[in-house]
Interface confidence: medium
């Protein structure tokens, strides 16, 4: 699985989408989990409704919500009031029995807004950080994400 980056601004909401094959995953509940270390387990944060037919109902665990469009094949996770400690590697999962299939690996990055003059603490300020070392993110990213040769945005 490649890793998809989703960036959010500290203090704001971030929506993460995980598309999937609705037929292949028909009848399956979904979950959002946080990867603990590069090879560690994925700790469940929140899962969809116990009744699959009610998966469209938004379920919350703290500041994280999950909802599933089972017909369209899109799982949506909302992280409310994004904080630096929310940065890291996550997975969208499709559950079947005691097993879980990974739908998408997600790297959540939390950026400070330097224009917001409230106490920014140790947030990552865009334009200043030169590497992940300065940012509060996990390093377990797939090769495709690290393609150094991908140019920034040829601009026109």
């Amino acid at each position: 699985h490649n890793t998809t980056v989703f960036q959010g601004v500290a203090g704001q909401s971030l929506q993460v989408s995980c598309p999937y094959d609705s037929m292949k995953h028909w009848g399956r509940r979904k979950a959002w989990c946080r990867q603990l270390g590069e090879k560690g387990p994925c700790q469940r944060v929140v899962s969809t409704h116990n009744l699959w037919l009610l998966s469209f109902l938004r379920r919350w665990n703290g500041s994280t919500a999950i909802t599933d469009d089972t017909l369209g094949g899109t799982l949506t996770i909302t992280l409310r009031n994004l904080q630096p400690h929310d940065a890291g590697l996550y997975q969208c999962q499709s559950l079947h029995g005691s097993e879980a299939d990974t739908l998408r690996k997600v790297l959540v990055e939390v950026l400070a807004d330097p224009l917001d003059h409230r106490d920014a603490g140790d947030l990552w300020f865009p334009g200043e950080s030169e590497s992940f070392e300065d940012a509060h993110v996990e390093h377990s990213i797939s090769r495709s994400l690290l393609e150094g040769e991908i140019p920034f945005p040829p601009t026109s």
């Epitope: 998809t4 980056v5 959010g8 601004v9 950080s129 300065d134 150094g148 920034f152 945005p153």
Partner: nanobody, 112 residues
Framework: ESGGGLVQPGGSLRLSCAAS????????MHWYRQAPEKERELVAI?????????NYAASVKGRFTISRDNAKNMVYLQMNNLKPEDTAVYYC?????????WGQGTQVTVSS
């Protein structure tokens, strides 16, 4: 970046920045500017996805508007009521793979 040029005080310009090579809609985007002999200054920021979150430097608030079109991988800066002190090279920026990435910039000159 494109859309810069020479404009009279009180005039308007719309800057555009086309991006490629990454999942544009997932990234926070910024417009910076750099005037001669001055440090680069963050002018505006827009959140990822729908770009509902925006914020502006005090010096441009109420005059500049940042927006994005995720379908076209574009970010825009609408600049109204321009002042001579807005003269600078304007850059769009994204923090990608942990590093800030800059375009070549577009010159905006406000003069009568």
């Amino acid at each position: 970046e494109s859309g810069g040029g020479l404009v009279q005080p009180g005039g308007s310009l719309r800057l555009s920045c086309a991006a490629s090579g990454f999942a544009f809609s997932n990234y926070v985007m910024h417009w910076y500017r750099q005037a001669p002999e001055k440090e680069r200054e963050l002018v505006a920021i827009i959140g990822s996805q729908g770009g509902a979150y925006t914020n502006y430097a005090a010096s441009v608030k109420g005059r500049f508007t940042i927006s994005r079109d995720n379908a076209k991988n574009m970010v825009y800066l609408q600049m109204n009521n321009l002042k001579p002190e807005d003269t600078a090279v304007y850059y769009c920026n994204v923090v990608y793979i942990g590093r800030p990435n800059w375009g070549q910039g577009t010159q905006v000159t406000v003069s009568s």
